[in-house]
């Protein structure tokens, strides 16, 4: 695995610890809570930054609504149990023995239930729509610029491959941002659109996973983008399933 | 060249608490994880935790949670482990290792809990 | 955990003989495999690190193998001196784990 040889450091995850013993001498940098060595030339998975964070210390016109299978993650931080490749686990349990079913990006998609709850897969996000409001500016931004400097960022600051960046719009206040990516279009190396919204929802909240990098300063045509609140749905390859109780 | 040394053999009561040392040369203390094996006569090498000396960043096995503690004294590059409310399942030796390759060891040091 | 199996528990040898020591890991683990001599009373000495990497001062008799979950440590012409207890160790993720060991014993 990549990291920066000179200083042996992490550029893309901070909840790393790293140090000169990979193979052939290499540095080798290794999640905080796992211990999993991480590539650090791209992004590190969500689930393995939860286990560190965890360890560590409408209007809708041009907008889009939500369909009815959107989950929201309401459920907050856990301690996530990560595969070997750094995935969720299709199951999750806390140390009280309740279970339930996680999409690709960790969030609940089933009721909860007890240690004998099967997941029988993983089940793939494959459309994330971040809804963003922004504090309020002389004018409203430019539709064309603020649409090419967010795609700019999920390129340079994300690495991820601009045809997963489906769709920007907007409506003073409001922002929202589409990605999409199906199983089959992901390709080995590509980063995974859920990795990329988790650093994106990190960076908006002041708590950049970069290393030593600054805060995110988001401007378009020189005017701060600033944003005081943040709403991110997840659409399932495969909808949810909740019992309607839930849903009332 | 890179060196750990441990402090001597202990024999100690049930129920008392021990702490174990470790001192490093030879390499950057700070910059390499520092971990600890249990080996019972007889048994296997049993991995207790390790510690990064830079960071202060400890991890455990569950089994030695409550067990052992891991500290580090950078000043003098030092590795410690207390182990706490010792019974005769302590016994055995206890090594220190520079991780996660484990390429330096110890010598060892051998715990006897009695009474 | 990652459950590390070594097999067999005991080897026995003549000097002079080619042997192969056996270590499969619970999941993949890529190469983060390593393999340690032991002899009696002495610290574990480091012989192989990921899988197949040679170490300064231990002789080119030992050698490794493997990826994945199947992982082999080889001496191709078995002395005396490598009479010990053997034993492999997993540095994929915490907690690290050791193989319950392979006795060597010489005929």
């Known amino acids: 695995h990549t990291a920066a040889q000179d200083n042996c450091t992490c550029p893309t995850n901070k909840m790393t610890v790293c140090s000169p013993d990979g193979p052939g001498g290499r540095c080798q940098c290794r999640a905080l809570g796992s211990g999993m060595a991480v590539d650090c030339s791209t992004l590190t998975s969500k689930c393995l930054l939860l286990k560190a964070r965890m360890s560590a210390p409408k209007n809708a016109r041009t907008l889009v609504r939500p369909s009815e299978h959107a989950l929201v993650d309401n459920d907050g931080l856990y301690d996530p149990d990560c595969d070997p490749e750094g995935r969720f686990k299709a199951r999750q349990c806390n140390q009280t023995s309740v279970c339930w079913c996680v999409n690709s990006v960790g969030v609940r998609r089933t009721d909860k239930g007890d240690l004998s709850l099967r997941c029988d897969e993983l089940v793939r996000t494959h459309h994330i729509l971040i809804d963003l409001r922004h504090r309020p500016t002389a004018g409203a931004f430019n539709h064309s610029d603020l649409d090419a400097e967010l795609r700019r960022l999920f390129r340079e600051r994300y690495r991820l491959h601009p045809k997963f960046v489906a769709a920007v719009h907007y409506e003073q206040p409001t922002i929202q941002i589409e990605l999409r990516q199906n199983t089959s279009q992901k390709a080995a190396g590509d980063v995974d659109i859920g990795d990329a919204a988790y650093y994106f929802e990190r960076d908006i909240k002041g708590e950049s996973l970069f290393q030593g990098r600054g805060g995110l300063d988001l401007r378009v045509r020189g005017e701060p983008l600033q944003v005081e609140r943040t709403l991110i749905y997840y659409l399932d390859e495969i909808p949810p399933k909740f019992s309607m109780k839930r849903l009332t | 060249q890179v060196q750990l040394q441990q402090s001597g053999a202990e024999l100690v009561r049930p129920g008392t608490s021990v702490k174990i040392s470790c001192k490093a040369s030879g390499y950057t203390f700070t910059n390499y994880w520092l971990g600890w094996v249990k080996q019972r006569p007889g048994h296997g090498l049993e991995w207790i935790g390790n510690?990064?000396?830079?960071?202060?960043?400890?991890n455990y096995n569950e089994k030695f949670k409550g067990k052992a503690i891991l500290t580090a004294d950078t000043s003098s590059s030092t590795a410690y482990m207390q182990l706490s409310s010792l019974t005769s399942e302590d016994s055995g030796v206890y090594f220190c290792?520079?991780?996660?390759?484990?390429?330096?060891w110890g010598q060892g040091t051998t715990l006897t809990v009695s009474s | 955990d990652i459950l590390l199996t070594q097999s067999p528990a005991i080897l026995s040898v003549s000097p002079g003989e080619r042997v192969s020591f056996s270590c499969r890991a619970s999941?993949?683990?890529?190469?983060?495999i390593h393999w340690y001599q032991q002899r009696t009373n002495g610290f574990p000495r480091l012989l192989i690190k990921?899988?197949?990497e040679s170490i300064s001062g231990i002789p080119s008799r030992f050698s490794g193998s493997g990826s994945g979950t199947d992982f082999t440590l080889s001496i191709n012409s078995v002395e005396s001196e490598d009479i010990a207890d053997y034993y492999c160790?997993?540095?994929?993720?915490?907690?690290?784990?050791f193989g319950s060991g392979t006795k060597l014993e010489i005929k």
């Open positions: 160790q997993q540095s994929y993720s915490w907690p690290f784990t």
């Open positions: 290792a520079r991780e996660g390759v484990m390429d330096y």
């Open positions: 999941q993949n683990i890529g190469t983060s």
């Open positions: 510690i990064f000396p830079g960071g202060g960043y400890t």
């Open positions: 990921y899988a197949s």
